[in-house]
Amino acid sequence: SEAEDASLLSFMQGYMKHATKTAKDALSSVQESQVAQQARGWVTDGFSSLKDYWSTVKDKFSEFWDLDPEVRPTSAVAA
């Protein structure tokens, strides 16, 4: 009957709404987890990069004038 059909349709709509919400929540949870993981990755990489940066700042490169000369003195003397 039409009443039964309407009741079944209403039930199915309710079920689909609930299922959709459950799926969305699950997907949202997964996405949040992935975002959290990505964020953790960024933070970790950031700290790693920061550590490298500070080590470079702390251990300053030798000045260009304080590196090996183009012509070594022994060569210059020999010449």
Epitope: F61, S62, W65, L67, P69, P73
Partner: antibody
Framework: QLVESGGGLVQPGGSLRLSCAAS????????MRWVRQVPGKGLEWVSS????????AYRDSVKGRFTISRDNAKNTLYLQMNSLRAEDTAIYYC???????WGQGTLVTVSS | DIVMTQSPLSLPVTPGESASISCKTS???????????FYWFLQKPGQSPQQLIY???NRASGVPDRFSGSGSGTDFTLKISRVKAEDAGVYYC?????????FGQGTRLEIK
């Protein structure tokens, strides 16, 4: 050839001036360094100076106490050491940048 | 500061045999100019250090081809083939890439 002089016994807080006479190469075209060695122990870079003397570099423990300088007309490198401490006791070597050539060293002893 | 860790610290060798010394660094040593300022020295008893190798693998003037340097990154090696009695002494690795320049603690090579 590099010949150091000026080492000796000095009391804590005292001063010394080391000299390094260079010969056999064009002194003014090479940056120079001082390296020290506690007798029987390892080596430690102390300071470096640019060919013209315009640029200098020091290890942290001697900054503000030691001054590196040079006189290219006299082919001589210097290290003025003030406020000397017991831990500055070492043989001080004059070295050409690149560590290719070393002097024989001069001993500095800081003791009361 | 960059830490240079040498091994072994003592190395007994029979004349004619080969010897190998390792130097591990706490950080890579490539300068911003693309070169690696890594060195090996030999200090014989009562003498100043003498340079054997510069920029990882280049032999210094007058150094026999029995001495060879290799390595990259943080691992470097000095190999001495056909060891002679005159090779006895303390071997040091060092770098000049960053301030302060630092040296290894030394490896004593003794002839058996």
């Amino acid at each position: 050839q590099l010949v150091e002089s000026g080492g000796g016994l000095v009391q804590p807080g005292g001063s010394l001036r080391l000299s390094c006479a260079a010969s056999g190469f064009t002194f003014g075209t090479y940056s120079m360094r001082w390296v020290r060695q506690v007798p029987g122990k390892g080596l430690e870079w102390v300071s470096s100076i640019h060919t013209e003397g315009g640029g200098t570099a020091y290890r942290d423990s001697v900054k503000g106490r030691f001054t590196i300088s040079r006189d290219n007309a006299k082919n001589t490198l210097y290290l003025q050491m003030n406020s000397l401490r017991a831990e500055d006791t070492a043989i001080y070597y004059c070295v050409i940048a690149g560590y290719s050539d070393w002097g024989q060293g001069t001993l500095v002893t800081v003791s009361s | 500061d960059i830490v240079m860790t040498q091994s072994p610290l003592s190395l007994p060798v029979t004349p004619g045999e080969s010897a190998s010394i390792s130097c591990k660094t706490s950080q890579g040593l490539v300068h911003s100019d693309g070169k690696t300022y890594f060195y090996w020295f030999l200090q014989k008893p009562g003498q100043s250090p003498q340079q054997l190798i510069y920029q990882v693998s280049n032999r210094a003037s007058g150094v026999p081809d029995r001495f060879s340097g290799s390595g990259s990154g943080t691992d470097f090696t000095l190999k001495i083939s056909r060891v002679k009695a005159e090779d006895a002494g303390v071997y040091y690795c060092a770098h000049g890439t960053y301030y302060p320049h630092t040296f290894g603690q030394g490896t004593r090579l003794e002839i058996k």
